[in-house]
């Protein structure tokens, strides 16, 4: 499943954040004209992934891949041949299930976020990791940081690169 | 995507190997009448996953899941709704792309194997992990071990459990 077919710039940013790759994150954020406060907010999220080590990146990448390739994201877009299969439930827009997950990651409670992840990947190690990341983000980010992250996400979702 | 619908015994063996579960591996190998040398060969592969820890299992599971749910594997079997999606490109036979990946894992060079994985999952962390596993298998397994692993795979592919 080619996630990049839905909203490539979103996945660029996600994997740059999750892989702790500052260079790739800067490159991706420049493409969507991120402000300094928006960059700062994303780097706080990135710090959580880096602090939690490689396993964190992989497990959360696994969650993202799983949600993105789930029935909820593949929606009505299945053609009669796999050749034409696309994830674009809404043109090239990001899948609503992914959007919901990201929103809960920023604005929901740890329980709400972990429950949403559990719908897609219920391995205990995955859920523990999701909670650790969520708690880290809640501890590191101010309300203002979260608002900046949400405004950046809006830029991403409405970007021509999405 | 239900991989088990294509060749359940193959995925039983793969996940037993990748998860370092000796008991499950023994059970699965008994079902296909594996010889002692064939068991030894599979256990050497399993050792590589165990030595490389949880991260290795998760990442390689991600690769296998991705290849198994790729366009190359979904073949002509797509229905009009995702609900009915099946992988059975050739009845219940294993997908050729999965077969090719496993063959390269055993008989190809590290470059050849990683390049094939890269067609499905181009994250650096996934590809580095694939190379580490491949290097380990090349170091641990003799030519005879590899021949035994290939003969076991033939038994799996032609088994009524596939």
């Amino acid at each position: 499943v080619k996630m990049a077919e839905t909203c490539p710039i979103f996945y660029d940013v996600f994997f740059a954040v999750a892989n702790g790759n500052e260079l790739l994150l800067d490159l991706s954020l420049t493409k969507v004209n991120a402000t300094e406060p928006e960059r700062t907010a994303m780097k706080k999220i990135q710090d959580c992934y880096v602090e939690n080590g490689l396993i964190s990146r992989v497990l959360d990448g696994l969650v993202m891949t799983t949600i993105s390739s789930s029935k909820d994201c593949m929606g009505e877009a299945v053609q009669n041949t796999v050749e034409d299969l696309k994830l674009n439930t809404l043109g090239r827009e990001i899948c609503p299930a992914v959007k919901r997950g990201v929103d809960l990651f920023l604005t929901g409670t740890p329980d709400e976020y972990v429950e949403q992840v559990a719908q897609y990947k219920a391995l205990p190690v995955v859920l523990e990791n999701a909670r650790i990341l969520k708690n880290c983000v809640d501890a590191k980010m101010t309300e203002e940081d979260k608002e900046n992250a949400l405004s950046l996400l809006d830029k991403i979702y409405t970007s021509p690169l999405c | 995507v239900k991989m088990a619908e294509t060749c359940p015994i193959f995925y039983d063996v793969f996940f037993a190997v990748a998860n370092g579960n000796e008991l499950l591996l023994d059970l699965s190998l008994t079902k296909v009448n594996a010889t002692e040398p064939e068991r030894t060969a599979m256990k050497k592969i399993q050792d590589c996953y165990v030595e490389n820890g949880l991260i290795s299992r998760v990442l390689d599971g991600l690769v296998m899941t991705t290849i198994s749910s790729s366009k190359d594997c979904m073949g002509e079997a797509v229905q009009n709704t995702v609900e009915d999606l099946k992988l059975n490109t050739l009845g219940r036979e294993i997908c050729p792309a999965v077969k090719r990946g496993v063959d390269l894992f055993l008989t190809g060079t590290p470059d050849e194997y990683v390049e094939q994985v890269a067609q499905y999952k181009a994250l650096p962390v996934v590809l580095e992990n694939a190379r580490i596993l491949k290097n380990c298998v090349d170091a641990k397994m003799t030519e005879e071990d590899k021949e035994n692993a290939l003969s076991l795979l033939d038994k799996i592919y032609t088994s009524p459990l596939c």
Epitope: G20, N21, E22, L23, L24, L27, V50, G53, L54 | D111, V114, E115, A118, A122, L123, P124, L127, E128, N129, R131, I132
Partner: antibody, heavy 123, light 107 residues
């Protein structure tokens, strides 16, 4: 097997230019990021530049930015390093190296190296 | 740039010895670390990547460990072919940076 052969080194005066080439064989050239790494006489290794597998991104160490340009020709399996405004401190053996991992190319792990070509900047 | 510091700079050892080289990063590089071996007049050779992953064809006596800022390269039983200079290199960022090298010489 993977073979990388550098050429174009030599003695050059400060302020002048030189172009290094690296011919690659034995692998799918267009799938890999390629790098230049240098080593001053008796010193350690210093990464100089990278070009991604498709030429879409190029990065340089700060000390050569604006003076050196990396490029590639995927049809001829060759990468180049155009070195302008050379300085004495650019004196080094220049190695061409291939990224270990294909396509992603973002991780600068140097899996394969050429034998190197010596560049001497001296008046 | 991330600074990589190796210790010791020179190490005298005998065949059969267990040898350990340390590499410290000025900030966390997670597991994105490689080790290289270089012999005089030759190009470096990749030994280990992702902190502990052995490259193809490298003997099992070489092993790597560590994450974050502290890493080690261990040679379990030094062989005559192992006398060389060893470099660590982080690849968490561009620019990738190398340690200054550790020369392993015959005691």
């Amino acid at each position: 097997q993977v073979v990388l052969v550098e050429s174009g080194g030599g003695v050059v005066q400060p302020g002048r230019s030189l172009r290094l080439s690296c011919a690659a064989s034995g692998f799918t050239f267009s799938s890999y990021g390629m790098h230049w790494v240098r080593q001053a006489p008796g010193k350690g290794l210093e990464w100089v530049a990278v070009i991604w597998y498709d030429g879409s991104n190029k990065y340089y160490v700060d000390s050569v930015k604006g003076r050196f340009t990396i490029s590639r020709d995927n049809s001829n399996n060759t990468i180049y390093l155009q070195m302008n405004s050379l300085r004495a401190e650019d004196t080094a053996v220049y190695y061409c190296a291939r990224s270990l991992i294909p396509v992603a190319g973002t991780d600068p792990i140097f899996g394969y190296w050429g034998q190197g070509t010596l560049v001497t900047v001296s008046s | 740039d991330i600074q990589m510091t190796q210790s010791p700079s020179t190490l005298s050892a005998s065949v059969g010895d267990r040898v350990t080289i340390t590499c410290r990063a000025s900030q966390s590089v997670s597991s994105w670390l490689a080790w290289y071996q270089q012999k005089p007049g030759k190009a470096p050779k990749l030994l280990i990547f992702k902190a502990s992953g052995l490259e193809s064809g490298v003997p099992f006596r070489f092993s790597g460990s560590g994450s974050g800022t502290e890493f080690t390269l261990t040679i379990s039983s030094l062989q005559p072919d192992d006398f060389a200079t060893y470099y660590c290199q982080q690849y968490n960022t561009y620019s990738p940076t190398f340690g200054q090298g550790t020369k392993v010489e015959i005691k």
